[in-house]
Structure formats: structure tokens, C-alpha cells
């Protein structure tokens, strides 16, 4: 079999749900003497970068100006060590929102809970689209989807205080273009009277993975690398 | 707003040269990614060659060898130097630019490009 080169990492620098006519930078994370990165769209390359020195450095970051539906879509990276290709990336789906309207969010039976209460989200957008997402802040990865011609429904099922945070929704075009987010509704969830002060509220991370933890190699780094290899050599 | 003016088409033999001139209006040219691209009769836009802010180069393995990309960016200019010209390479040919650019990405999707010039037409024939 051809041989090749571990799968590099590919993330969103900020977030994948990038508005219209802003920029994108996507990560592509590789191995230290890497010659060239591909950024590849929709299974078409996009973009090349080829790192100086490669020695050096263990990823790219790939921009992507002024956002729009055309470049919205599935993004993967490839690198190259020598005449050696890596395997692909995983896909990443870059999502342009703040396209055509502003939908509206609301809470049934209303935003105060207590703990087992039965909630549902409507999401409301009058414009054209069948499909309506939910999403909770800090949460931007776990992506709730639902169906319908103006409004659409997310049942929660009996709340905890884990449900707790803030909610937004949006109007989906397509599986990549959507729509303007609604204005947030945040969901109070109170327990007991014993656990209440107890119960932690679900930290808003904001997508602590979404961020690009590309390195520089320095001298400082080699020399410390070589002091251990030589350190393990007279241990032996 | 970059405003992108292409020059230099025209009739050439089979094997002759061409050199392709893309004027830049505006102040942000040196930190656009700059590329060609070409669109033969009834056929779609295809990629020809592109060049980062910092001049690294990518080329369509249609033209590697014999079609040089390079860029002027105190004239604001973009050029495409085409050698041994072939029947084939009857096309429109488009500069575009990306802008504005961070980092030393070549583009070599038409989608990343957000400004076109008009075109100029190269015509290879006996």
C-alpha cells in the first residue's frame, strides 16, 4: 500500500459560523518540516501555503476574506513532507450566517423553570426556509435541527439545571447559509431548595476547541530536545 | 474598491509568447493575493496560475513550465508571461485579486477571489 503521512487537524480559528462578509481562518495543523499545505473545498483545492522555514513551524492558517454562500461548505487539509503526502483531515463544515432575516425565539411555558418542567423552544422566521436550528450558547457545536414552513418546535423534555444558559436560533437555507441569529432567550432553571445553590450552571466555554494551537519550533526548543535525547542516551 | 484592468491579448502562432498585464487601482494591491484565470469558448472558468503576497507561486499542470506569474507592486501590476503557446490556450483571460489578505495564501479557487478584471482574449492559431 502507498504509504502516507498522519492525518492533519483542521479547525476554525474563532468559530465555523462566520457572518456574511467577514473573514474565515481556518488551522490546518501538520507536522514541523512540512513544505506545503492544501486547503481543499467541496473536494477542490482552494488554497496552498507552504511554510518558511518548514522546519519550524507545524500548521497553517488559511483566510478566508469576505465570507459569503460560495465558500460556505466542507473544508479539508492536506500537507506534504518531501515528495510524502499526509492523509486527509477530518471535514470541517464553514457555515456563513447573517444571510436575508432575523427570526424570533420564545419559551414555552416561559423562561423561569423549575427542574422537570416540560420546555419548548419555537423558532420563527417568515421568510422562506423549512429548517430552523437551535443552539446554546457556548454550546455552538451541539446543534439542534427541526422542520417547518414558518415556525418550528424543540421540545426539551423535562428540564434540569444542566438545560440552563442562553439559547439562540437560526433559519437555514441550506445546510451551510443561515440565517441572522435570533436575540438570545436565556433559560433559568431552578431545582430544590437543596441543591439549588449547588447545582453548577453549564459554563459558557466559548468553544475552547475552536481555537488554532499552531507552533513555532525555537532554537531554545531543538536544544532542549537534543539535551534530552542526549541525557536519555546516558542514562542508558 | 479594486478596479482590475487586463492587457496584452491578442493573435499568436503556435509556439510564439504572449505577456498578460493586469492593472491594479488602489492603495491595497501589495497585500492582495493575486491570480489568473482562463475561460476557453464554450467552457467554464478554469485556474491558470497564482501568486501570494510574498510571491510564492502555484500553477494549473496545464501551463506548469511554460507560463510565469509575477507581480510589480509598485506599479500596481500583475503579469502573466506565457511561452510556447498551444492551440489549447485560446481563452479569456481574467486577473482577479483577493482582498483584503492575511499570511502567504496562494488561491486557487475562482470562489476566493472577490474582485475580476473584464478580461482580455488570447487567441492561438496557425
Known amino acids: 500500500p502507498k504509504q502516507t503521512l498522519p492525518k492533519p487537524i483542521i479547525r476554525a480559528e474563532s468559530t465555523y459560523m462566520v457572518p456574511k462578509e467577514k473573514q474565515a481562518t481556518l488551522c490546518c495543523q501538520g507536522s514541523y518540516g512540512a513544505v506545503e499545505y492544501q486547503l481543499h473545498f467541496e473536494g477542490s483545492l482552494f488554497a496552498v501555503e507552504r511554510p518558511k522555514p518548514p522546519e519550524r513551524i507545524n500548521g497553517v492558517k488559511f483566510h478566508i476574506p469576505d465570507m459569503n454562500s460560495r465558500k460556505a461548505g466542507r473544508y479539508s487539509c492536506i500537507y506534504r513532507v518531501g515528495e510524502l503526502w499526509s492523509e486527509r483531515s477530518d471535514l470541517l463544515d464553514l457555515v456563513v450566517t447573517e444571510m436575508y432575516d432575523t427570526p424570533t425565539l420564545s419559551v414555552h411555558p416561559g423562561p423561569e423553570v423549575t427542574s422537570g418542567e416540560k420546555v419548548t423552544f419555537y423558532c420563527r422566521l417568515d421568510t422562506a426556509t423549512s429548517m430552523f436550528l437551535l443552539l446554546k450558547e457556548g454550546r455552538s457545536r451541539d446543534v439542534q435541527r427541526s422542520y417547518g414552513k414558518v415556525q418550528a418546535e424543540f421540545p426539551m423534555g423535562p428540564v434540569t439545571t444542566a438545560h440552563r444558559g442562553s439559547y439562540r436560533c437560526f433559519g437555514s437555507y441550506n445546510n451551510y447559509a443561515w440565517s441572522f441569529p435570533s436575540e438570545p432567550v436565556k433559560l433559568l432553571v431552578t431545582g430544590d431548595i437543596e441543591n439549588t445553590s449547588l447545582a453548577p450552571t453549564d459554563p459558557t466555554f466559548p468553544d475552547s476547541w475552536d481555537t488554532c494551537l499552531l507552533t513555532r519550533e525555537t532554537g531554545l526548543q531543538k536544544d532542549l530536545a537534543l539535551w534530552d535525547h542526549t541525557a536519555q542516551n546516558l542514562l542508558r | 474598491e479594486v478596479q482590475l484592468v487586463e492587457s496584452g491579448g491578442g493573435e499568436v502562432q503556435p509556439g510564439g509568447s504572449l505577456r498578460l498585464s493586469c492593472a491594479a487601482s488602489?492603495?491595497?494591491?501589495?497585500?492582495?493575493?493575486m491570480g489568473w484565470f482562463r475561460q476557453a469558448p464554450g467552457k467554464g472558468r478554469e485556474f491558470v496560475a497564482a501568486?501570494?503576497?510574498?510571491?510564492?507561486?502555484y500553477y494549473a499542470e496545464s501551463v506548469k513550465g511554460r507560463f510565469t506569474i509575477s507581480r510589480d507592486n509598485a506599479k500596481n501590476t500583475l503579469y502573466l508571461q506565457m511561452s510556447s503557446l498551444r492551440a489549447e490556450d485560446t481563452a479569456v483571460y481574467y486577473c482577479?485579486?483577493?482582498?483584503?489578505?492575511?499570511?502567504?495564501?496562494?488561491?486557487?479557487?475562482?470562489?476566493?477571489?472577490?474582485?475580476w478584471g473584464q478580461g482580455t482574449l488570447v487567441t492561438v492559431k496557425p
Open positions: 488602489g492603495r491595497t494591491f501589495a497585500s492582495a493575493a
Open positions: 482577479a485579486a483577493v482582498v483584503p489578505t492575511y499570511g502567504n495564501n496562494i488561491y486557487v479557487h475562482s470562489a476566493a477571489y472577490n474582485y
Open positions: 501568486i501570494s503576497r510574498s510571491d510564492d507561486t
